[in-house]
């Protein structure tokens, strides 16, 4: 029995619902009484949801899963996962048994956009050319880990003296703090970009130092 799932991972935003697609081709005369369907976590074999003896056996996964009962007879064995969490990320296997047996695994990639970075400066007053300053770029509650880039006011990458840390909160979402140490010129703009590699979402912030006062666009 051929079971079909998407090749590419299913990308779902934290807090939204995701559909893990799975389909099979029922033969003529097929009835739901013949169908055994099991969704499980590929790695741990933990049961997620099942259908047997013509009946939906319900969710074994935090009561956040559902099948599409009206579509099962047409060979649609897809699973709906509600209120996606970071912990849901991984591979799910769809097992289908009628007379024959088949299975396929689909990957769930969880994502959350990063907030617009906030920029802080230390020290933040009485700055003169030649002073060393620390610029911190902070962005919150994203997933997965971000890529962080710095540029000067002419678009030239700044790669030296950059330290980036990423800490996961209790929901598994990351807070990013990237610190750039620079020696000030006469004036200058410093920009930080936080990129979510899954969503290909960019969030950026910048600080312009022009003696006094400083501006935070």
């Amino acid at each position: 029995l051929e079971v079909q799932v998407p090749e590419d991972p299913v990308v779902a935003l934290v807090g939204t619902d995701a559909t893990l697609c799975c389909s099979f081709s029922p033969e003529p005369g097929f009835s739901l009484a013949q169908l055994n369907l099991i969704w499980q976590l590929t790695d741990t074999k933990q049961l997620v949801h099942s259908f047997a003896e013509g009946q939906d056996q319900g969710s074994a996964y935090a009561n956040r899963t559902a099948l599409f009962p009206d579509l099962l007879a047409q060979g649609n064995a897809s699973l709906r996962l509600q209120r996606v969490r970071v912990a849901d990320e991984g591979s799910f296997t769809c097992f289908v048994s009628i007379r024959d047996f088949g299975s396929a695994a689909v990957s769930l990639q969880v994502a959350a956009p990063y907030s617009k970075p906030s920029m802080t400066l230390e020290p933040n007053k009485d700055l003169r050319p030649g002073d060393t300053v620390t610029i911190t770029c902070s962005s919150y509650r994203g997933y997965p880990e971000a890529e962080v880039f710095w540029q000067d006011g002419q678009g030239v990458p700044l790669t030296g003296n950059v330290t980036t840390s990423q800490m996961a909160n209790e929901q598994g979402l990351f807070d990013v703090h990237s610190v750039l140490r620079v020696v000030l010129g006469a004036n200058g703009t410093y920009s930080c970009l936080v990129r979510n590699p899954v969503l290909q979402q960019d969030a950026h912030g910048s600080v312009t130092i022009t003696g006094q006062p400083m501006t935070f666009p």
């Epitope: 002419q154 030239v156 006469a186 290909q200 666009p217």
Partner: antibody, heavy 121, light 106 residues
Framework: EVQLQQSGPELVRPGVSVKISCKGS????????MHWVKQSHAKSLEWIGV????????YYNLKFKGKATMTVDKSSSTAYMELARLTSEDSAIYYC??????????????WGAGTTVTVSS | DIVMTQSPVIMSASPGEKVTMTCSAS?????MHWYQQKSSTSPKLWIY???KLASGVPGRFSGTGSGKSHSLTISSMEAEDVATYYC?????????FGSGTKLEIK
Amino acid sequence: EVQLQQSGPELVRPGVSVKISCKGSGYTFTDYSMHWVKQSHAKSLEWIGVINTSSGNTYYNLKFKGKATMTVDKSSSTAYMELARLTSEDSAIYYCSKYYGSSFHWYFDVWGAGTTVTVSS
Amino acid sequence: DIVMTQSPVIMSASPGEKVTMTCSASSSVSYMHWYQQKSSTSPKLWIYDTSKLASGVPGRFSGTGSGKSHSLTISSMEAEDVATYYCFQGSGYPLTFGSGTKLEIK
């Protein structure tokens, strides 16, 4: 009118170095970075690197690190690129180009006429 | 590195014909920019920020796209459009160009 005036063609022997120049006019030279781009028949357009014309900060394409060195003379509004240990693979047209934009949103708005470098014994 | 793939490599169009060329990026880009290069001259900015025409570019040119897939269209081919067109991304270093689409006239 914004212009980038590049130095003339160079015919050089393998193994030596060459330094080509790009003089900016019609704008505040130290407000915009200068990039260098190589064009050869084999590889189309290849980005070599960039220099901040105010601070002198540089960033190179890894492929050209050790091959190209970029400098700037603010007093004459001129950017330079030196190419070292030349081989026939370095024979190409080299363009300087001015980068325009802000905060991770940039493009080349003006190009020089190009400097042809021919490496031949 | 973000790899830019342009297609077709060479194309030929009759005067008045609609022309479309594409540029596919290996990763999503915020904006695509296009340059026109005529033989023995330097490239010229032609379309920037995906869809904005540079100064002096005729209105028959347009650019569209998002993410990984972008295109340049000429609504009605003219003889002066014969050139090579390069796409370019400034979203990530190293900066990269497509290998170009050479446009000829029939």
